[in-house]
């Protein structure tokens, strides 16, 4: 069964940036993806998040699994360089977590590094992971081009930058990756597409928000996803089935710092890719290992 944590997710979340610590088992689909690219000179290491779809498959953003090249060519990292942690709560203590290597890394064939269109990817795990209270799949949405409705509230979790005083430029230039030790989460509303498009079009630079993306966040800022949260699932509770569905994947944000005023986070619209995901997983919808909310 998918999208049913053993611990019920809270209905209210305090006003990640501006988030709070997650309790263990609250996001049992949450995966930490660590990439150590030894083919680069010097070796490069980074991390992102992902979401468990079944015992063997992780959904994430393509930009997490693209080799961090000196050009804009889209080449996936080698599977040997990917480690996935599931059931992880505190990154300082991986003893209770399940770690797995990758059997396959699959980037969407149309992923575009210039605008992050089609920012979606899959990792097939070397061995199926045992499911339990802290390791459970999330549900995939229905095939729905509209995506989540404006103003719907979703939750997103990650171990990314949780300190709003650390600037993105500092992190990029220092080469360090500032993780929050404990999984953070935040509740964010879906922003109307037109409002988000307008907010990004007013900026200098190429900030196109395509139909394969949606935005979430607050006009006043203060709560947001940030570097290192990339690929994490934006989940919404399906009213009918009462299951959590992955509607978005943390993709990108504006040039300003995370959590800035009128800078919405941009997410891959997963509902546009349901067929592609099933096709890669080689699993017809009807007998899905995790499942689609129908």
């Amino acid at each position: 069964e998918c999208g049913q944590p053993s611990r019920s997710l809270p209905s209210l979340v305090k006003r990640i940036i501006g988030g709070r610590n997650a309790e263990p088992g609250l996001f049992p689909w949450q995966a930490l993806i660590v990439v150590e690219d030894t083919s680069r000179v010097p070796n490069d290491k980074w991390f992102g998040s992902g979401a468990l779809l079944s015992e063997s498959w992780i959904l994430t953003a393509a930009h997490v699994l693209r080799s961090q090249r000196r050009d804009t060519t889209v080449i996936p990292v080698s599977k040997e360089h990917v480690t996935v942690y599931l059931g992880l709560h505190d990154v300082r203590d991986k003893s209770g977590a399940v770690n797995s290597s990758a059997a396959r890394v699959v980037l969407h064939p149309d992923f575009n590094i210039q605008n992050y269109n089609h920012d979606i990817a899959l990792v097939q795990l070397q061995e199926p992971v045992p499911l339990g209270p802290h390791v459970m799949p999330v549900c995939l949405p229905r095939l729905e081009p509209e995506g989540p409705s404006p103003h719907m509230l979703g939750l997103v979790a990650g171990w990314g930058i949780s300190n709003p005083n650390v600037t993105v430029d500092e992190i990029i230039s220092s080469g360090t990756r500032t993780l929050s030790d404990v999984l953070q989460y935040v509740k964010l509303p879906v922003v109307p597409h037109a409002e988000c498009k307008t907010s990004y079009e007013s900026r200098s630079g190429n900030y196109s928000v395509t139909e394969n993306m949606f935005c979430a966040g607050y006009y006043e800022g203060g709560k947001d996803t940030c570097l290192g949260d990339s690929g994490g699932a934006f989940v919404i509770l399906d009213d009918l089935s009462q299951r959590w569905v992955v509607q978005g994947l943390v993709s990108w944000g504006g040039p300003e710092e995370c959590g800035s005023k009128q800078v919405y986070g941009v997410y891959t619209k997963v509902s546009n890719y349901v067929d592609w995901v099933w096709e890669q997983m080689g699993s017809p919808q009807g007998r899905a290992p995790g499942g689609t909310v129908s």
């Epitope: 090249r69 000196r70 050009d71 804009t72 060519t73 080449i75 210039q114 430029d169």
Partner: antibody
Amino acid sequence: QVQLKQSGPELVKPGASVKLSCKASGYTFTTDDINWVKQRPGQGLEWIGWIYPRDDRTKYNDKFKDKATLTVDTSSNTAYMDLHSLTSEDSAVYFCSSLEDTYWGQGTLVAVSS
Amino acid sequence: DIVMTQSPSSLAVSAGEKVTMTCKSSQSLLNSRTRKNYLAWYQQKPGQSPKLLIYWASTRESGVPDRFTGSGSGTDFSLTISSVQAEDLAVYYCKQSYNLYTFGGGTKLEIK
């Protein structure tokens, strides 16, 4: 250590074709693309194209689309460039590079003359 | 296609002097998603293959002396050699990798 060893100099007649090779060693050949660059005597560098050995994907500079064909043989860790319908304009040194230009071959001189 | 223009085409300096050469691109090389400028600098000494010095506009390749510094963003970039040495005699090329690849025409550095 990483090495890219290119084939020796070629003297070819106008209208003929030539196949240059670039043998890689010291790294996993399929992890990175191979680029080819042209340099005419006393001139600058021109990018011809690249090939990604893991899936044979290629990209070309429009100028060289009908001039060069890039291939690889993963069993021998070797990249090849075929140059067709040669003219005096194709007389140049051709370099291969890999691991995002961290490593370069020594270059192959192609001289086109009747 | 992105056009890369380097200036000057040649310059002569004495050992120990500071030298700056520039490179302009016909469109911005800053990727708003990755927040990187896709511009590299190469050194080619006479009779040798090119050598990568700088990538992402300002990141020095490992093993490159710290007298070589790259700077700039968007469309305007420069390479500075803080104290020119005799072994720096070479042609210096910039190259964009924002959309495929294009080299600039080169700047020939001669030592007086």
